[in-house]
């Protein structure tokens, strides 16, 4: 079986401030099991965003059913866009381990671009 | 939701000292973390930030160059390194949890009283 | 950078009556405003979010309204309890994160 890819298939993405942003993310594989996790920036500055397994994110919605065993869809919605939200977005799997998961790979990004709100 | 902040006193101007602050009743390593200071009789002051993984800080200009902050993970604590201290770093400092990564303060520790004074 | 600017600086109302805070920010900050509550000798605590949405716990007599650069607080009826300095904090443009220099309401 070929080794898990994960998509990002837009390179950017641009949205009005207070708008909605959806960044779109599928793998290929379901092995190895474990759990997605959304960053913002790379390297050891970045912003988590989204993590599947923990955590509580209000401004996050994932657009399909992550309990779902087959799901490889791991798009999410980000609510209430502000200009701090600007970045680059990386979609990252993780391999299932003891006693911490393990970043197995990631995503190419999408770059969310924040338009200010017309006055 | 709790926080407890620990590690404050009385220091000369130019020593150091390092406030810690103990997390608990949430994902600590989901959040990103700030400590924020009052001076007697006067209002809040945005000093630090750190992100969930630890590796990205911000300061306000007031200390930078002066104060580190670092978050232990593992152990579910966040920690304000002061050096070379000046009277008018004076204050309670409180340490704050973040709602998400860009968002407000939705919980406040009860704070640690820094005293500089020669 | 963002400044927030509160009035008045200290509100004297009597128990039962309405008091209404204002914070205006020197730019647009969408509705990315927070209001915190802090009463003498305690930690701040935080009432309203996103400019009108009440934090866990939060009595229904606090209400947020506003958006842009004009908000206000409103405490519908006053009681003896709600004896503190309020802060208004942006969260659109960061850092650094700023605070509003606070309202102290009083008991008449």
């Known amino acids: 079986e070929e080794e898990l890819q994960v998509i990002q298939p837009d390179k950017s993405v641009l949205v009005a401030a207070g708008e909605t942003a959806t960044l779109r993310c599928t793998a290929t594989s379901l092995i190895p099991v474990g759990p997605i996790q959304w960053f913002r920036g790379a390297g050891p500055g970045r912003e988590l965003i989204y993590n599947q397994k923990e955590g509580h994110f209000p401004r996050v919605t994932t657009v399909s059913d992550l309990t779902k065993r087959n799901n490889m869809d791991f798009s999410i919605r980000i609510g209430n866009i502000t200009p701090a939200d600007a970045g680059t977005y990386y979609c990252v799997k993780f391999r299932k381990g003891s006693p911490d998961d393990v970043e197995f790979k990631s995503g190419a990004g999408t770059e969310l671009s924040v338009r200010a709100k017309p006055s | 939701v709790q926080l407890v902040e620990s590690g404050g006193g009385v220091v000369r101007p130019g020593e150091s000292l390092r406030l810690s602050c103990a997390a608990s009743?949430?994902?600590?390593?989901?959040?990103?973390m700030n400590w924020v200071r009052q001076a007697p009789g006067e209002g809040l002051e945005w000093v630090s930030r750190?992100?969930?993984?630890?590796?990205?800080?911000d300061y306000a200009e007031s200390v930078k160059g002066r104060f580190t902050i670092s978050r232990d993970n593992s152990e579910n604590t966040l920690y304000l390194q002061m050096n070379s201290l000046r009277a008018e770093d004076t204050a309670v400092y409180y340490c704050a949890k973040q709602y998400d990564w860009n968002g407000f303060f939705d919980y406040w520790g009860l704070g640690a009283l820094v005293t500089v004074s020669s | 950078e963002t400044v927030l600017t509160q009035s008045p600086a200290t509100l004297s109302v009597s128990p039962g009556e309405r008091a209404t805070l204002s914070c205006r920010a020197s730019q647009t900050v969408g509705s990315k405003l927070a209001w915190h509550q802090q009463k003498p000798g305690q930690a701040p605590r935080l009432l309203i979010y996103?400019?009108?949405r009440r934090a866990t716990g939060i009595p229904d007599r606090f209400s947020g309204s506003g958006s842009g650069t004009d908000f206000t607080l409103t405490i519908s009826s006053l009681q003896t309890e709600d004896s503190a300095v309020y802060y208004c904090?942006?969260?659109?443009?960061?850092?650094?994160?700023?605070f509003g220099g606070g309202t102290k309401v009083e008991i008449k």
């Open positions: 750190i992100n969930s993984g630890g590796g990205g800080t």
């Open positions: 904090q942006q969260y659109y443009y960061w850092p650094p994160y700023r």
């Open positions: 009743g949430f994902s600590f390593s989901s959040y990103a």
């Open positions: 996103d400019a009108s």
